[in-house]
Interface confidence: medium
Amino acid sequence: EVEKTACPSGKKAPEIDESLIFYKKWELEACVDAALLATQMDRVNAIPFTYEQLDVLKHKLDELYPQGYPESVIQHLGYLFLKMSPEDIRKWNVTSLETLKALLEVNKGHEMSPQVATLIDRFVKGRGQLDKDTLDTLTAFYPGYLCSLSPEELSSVPPSSIWAVRPQDLDTCDPRQLDVLYPKARLAFQNMNGSEYFVKIQSFLGGAPTEDLKALSQQNVSMDLATFMKLRTDAVLPLTVAEVQKLLGPHVEGLKAEERHRPVRDWILRQRQDDLDTLGLGLQG
């Protein structure tokens, strides 16, 4: 901790400006008023302070706001945000999407840090649900964000937010997460015509039940093998050879290359050999 020392004569900072970069740590502690710092936080980012100097400024804010910073200060933290610990952030009440964006911008291009994860958690909990604008913002900064949430957290995503989800946002989702998201997507896209509906719902099909796959097989959709391989094994097993043939269309020949992998392997073992032979692919049950 920086020692408490009196500010030398004539050194009291009337405002936050470039001259402060020449102050030693103890001078910053003694000569910069914490309330002044709080009201002029937006200037700090434009000044090339050292990490040690930023530590002093953070310490001053901590003393001024022991219960947590107000949002007016949080919004202008800039690079000082990188100095915050998850414990600091848990004290905050962040409600503005603009504040969230400002802080995510500071961390842009890096992996999601514990600080950012805590910030997002505080923000989403404060809002009560993962609304569309929040989801838009978070997936823009972290395309894999959605798949980092637990099924319980995903249950707070309203169907209207599903329109914000892009195919790449679901790349790392596991079946438990897709189980939650699929019914929401089905509801969100229900008014679309057949071919557009299929392309929109495709990324979510890892959560689809057997009856929905059977229905899709009647719609001439030509599902690609990459999508088929992500389907739930328990949803695929009850499908007949004819249904899989209709579901995959011209992609059905790709089953041969995947015959040793789930869910294809398990599905093949459930079929009658006579039925498999109708595909002409040499699949052995």
């Epitope: 569309k132 604008d133 838009d136 209207s160 329109w163 914000a164 892009r166 195919p167 790449q168 896209f189 008014n191 679309m192 015509n193 071919s195 557009e196 509906y197 392309v199 929109k200 495709q202 030509s222 690609d224 990459a226 999508t227």
Partner: antibody, heavy 116, light 108 residues
Framework: QVQLQQSGAELMKPGASVKLSCKAT????????IEWVKQRPGHGLEWIGE????????NYNEKFKGKATFTADTSSNTAYMQLSSLTTEDSAIYYC?????????WGQGTLVTVSA | QIVLTQSPAIMSASLGERVTMTCTAS???????LHWYQQKPGSSPKLWTY???NLASGVPARFSGSGSGTSYSLTISSMEAEDAATYYC?????????FGGGTKLEIK
Amino acid sequence: QVQLQQSGAELMKPGASVKLSCKATGYTFTGYWIEWVKQRPGHGLEWIGEILPGSGSTNYNEKFKGKATFTADTSSNTAYMQLSSLTTEDSAIYYCARAGAWFAYWGQGTLVTVSA
Amino acid sequence: QIVLTQSPAIMSASLGERVTMTCTASSSVSSSYLHWYQQKPGSSPKLWTYSTSNLASGVPARFSGSGSGTSYSLTISSMEAEDAATYYCHQYHRSPWTFGGGTKLEIK
């Protein structure tokens, strides 16, 4: 049937702003993205950004952030794009399109000419 | 962002000739999200094929699309006069959405 009707041609001075409109009919306006696309004479198609009228949610091509602003009025089923601080580089045809899984329907385009 | 490169930029074909144009992506695009549009002078673009190989409503059967990953193509089995136009490929997979530079197809 689905139709997107865009506002008429605009002749603007450099530095001015212009607001283009795109009126949608024949489908549920709130349930599809409205995309905006720029085409300069003799050039290809360039995606500007999109708005989902149901929520007002927007996504912008980084290149057009600060240049284009999207809004939508669900009572009149109309999407708007405002272009600010116009320069001669903004002279182009601007299209709106409806997107579900692709840009299935396009407006007729609005020609914006920026000239001193 | 995904850059789509179309080749050739301009091509001419005789009536009845087989025509193929290509679209190469800078990184992999799911075939479900790769589409082609046709544009004629003075008109808006029209959806021509969707999800790589599906013909949009009203598109003649002489057109076909194929491809996967980073390589896609649009083929006309037998060129007709009305096919003269500019064709754009488009990816709707990863934002920002991008278009190829276009292939202008003329009659020889």
